[in-house]
């Protein structure tokens, strides 16, 4: 099965990764 | 028009195999961090794992349910993502969504595991 | 792991009027480059989820400006100043600060 699904545009976007931190580390365990 | 087209979805018996791909159009994919995420009917969100770019020397990371069994891959020449995976349990039954750093989303491919 | 709470579970909502929805994370979300990686997604009835803010309270290109966000460390709101009959979804929170990534367990919004 395949879908799409996109947000229009007029060229080549980028996606941005900016919701996600750089270099993660696992979290703590408390 | 960003566009993340994804496949492979299917019927698969537990112990089985399966290999889901996400082929991006509009974006500029090597940039891109890609992550699988999935939702088992009626629930809510899993993050399954994630690849890196070029850059991040294409590391990748993976939810502890499925590490071992899972493995994420892209190929930046083809604007493709994937997700392989193996020794599939009935409770990895969900729909598979591939996203851009939970940017861009595909509409989902849906994975059923059932005997 | 962290844990990602949400409130309320579900909420109804008359057209034009505020709506909030709390996240709360089970550890810090500031991240050592001062950044705190707290995301907000909606996923209308039938369609995939779609990223509101990211960064706590930046907004997504596109995105209406009666959506906002705020909050900090561990205690964030989303809060939409007058809301629309296209609003209606589950309302996830996400946190991106340390792995694995989790999410909230949503909040369902609909109209009265």
């Known amino acids: 099965s395949e879908t799409t699904t996109g947000t229009s545009s007029n060229s080549s976007q980028s996606t941005s990764n900016s919701g996600l931190a750089p270099n993660p580390t696992n979290a703590t365990t408390k | 028009e960003v566009q993340f087209v994804e496949s492979g979805g299917g019927l698969v018996q537990p112990g089985g195999s399966l290999k889901l791909s996400c082929a991006a159009s509009?974006?500029?994919?090597?940039?891109?961090?890609m992550d699988w995420v999935r939702q088992a009917s009626g629930k809510g969100l899993e993050w399954v794992g994630e690849?890196?770019?070029?850059?991040?020397?294409?590391?990748?990371y993976y939810a502890e349910s499925v590490k071992g069994r899972f493995t994420i891959s892209r190929d930046d020449s083809k604007n493709t993502a994937y997700l392989q995976m193996n020794s599939l349990k009935t409770e990895d039954t969900a729909v598979y969504y591939c996203?851009?750093?939970?940017?861009?989303w595909g509409q989902g491919t849906l994975v059923t595991v059932s005997s | 792991d962290i844990v990602m709470t949400q409130t309320p579970l579900s909420l109804s909502v008359t057209i034009g009027q505020p709506a909030s929805i709390s996240c709360k994370s089970s550890?810090?979300?500031?991240?050592?480059?001062?950044?705190?990686?707290l995301n907000w997604l909606l996923q209308k009835p039938g369609q995939s989820p779609k990223r509101l803010i990211y960064?706590?309270?930046k907004l997504d290109p596109g995105i209406p400006d009666r959506f906002s966000g705020s909050g900090s460390e561990t205690d964030f709101t989303l809060k939409i100043s007058r809301v629309e009959a296209e609003d209606v979804g589950i309302y996830y929170c996400?946190?991106?600060?340390?792995?694995?990534?989790?999410f909230g367990g949503g909040t369902k919004v609909e109209i009265k």
């Open positions: 996203t851009g750093a939970m940017d861009y």
């Open positions: 509009g974006v500029t994919f090597s940039e891109a961090w």
């Open positions: 690849i890196r770019d070029k850059p991040n020397s294409y590391v990748t």
């Open positions: 550890q810090s979300l500031l991240y050592s480059n001062g950044k705190t990686y």
């Open positions: 960064q706590v309270s």
């Open positions: 996400m946190q991106g600060s340390s792995l694995p990534w989790t």
